[in-house]
């Protein structure tokens, strides 16, 4: 019997990114974001 399998062809990876607040403003501390599929979403 033939076996059929659906495959979207790609995986979406996510990664935590951390930035320093002073690089993007004047505050102290770190900002944590999430990159999904190459796009920072949070």
């Amino acid at each position: 019997d033939a076996e059929f399998r659906h495959d979207s062809g790609y995986e979406v990876h996510h990664q935590k990114l951390v930035f320093f607040a002073e690089d993007v403003g004047s505050n102290k501390g770190a900002i944590i974001g999430l990159m999904v599929g190459g796009v920072v979403i949070a």
Partner: nanobody
Framework: AVQLVDSGGGLVQAGGSLRLSCAVS????????MGWFRQAPGKEREFVGA????????YYADSVKGRFTISRDGAKNTVYLQMNSLKDEDTAVYYC?????????????????WGQGTQVTVSS
């Protein structure tokens, strides 16, 4: 061109302390975000921690939080990694690295300047 020179590695007993230094030359020190990475044999190079350009903010990997401290001395153009309560699993080659402002601090590809690395061996 910006150059980073690591030093201070060595052999230390578990539970001991070591301070690594990274001297920065050839660039404007205050414009470079600095971080430390490490690479154990057979493993990927991993993020250890970073310090902001002003030195006001630091961020650490969970594995070293509370044990390692990063500081920077603008007068000497040097960044330090103070390592306390060292464990066997801290054995690795340690690299300091520099990145442009505005880039993510915890990923390797943000960093375009690298030191040559200094070996830290923790023995039990």
């Amino acid at each position: 061109a910006v150059q980073l020179v690591d030093s201070g590695g060595g052999l230390v007993q578990a539970g001991g302390s070591l301070r690594l230094s990274c001297a920065v030359s050839g660039g404007t020190f205050s414009s470079i975000g600095m971080g430390w990475f490490r690479q154990a044999p057979g493993k990927e190079r991993e993020f250890v921690g970073a310090i902001s350009r002003s030195g006001d903010s630091t961020y650490y990997a969970d594995s070293v939080k509370g044990r390692f401290t990063i500081s920077r001395d603008g007068a000497k153009n040097t960044v330090y990694l103070q390592m306390n309560s060292l464990k066997d699993e801290d054995t690795a080659v340690y690299y300091c690295a520099g990145r442009p402002a505005g880039t993510a601090i915890n990923i390797r590809r943000s960093y375009n300047y690298w030191g040559q690395g200094t070996q830290v061996t923790v023995s039990s």
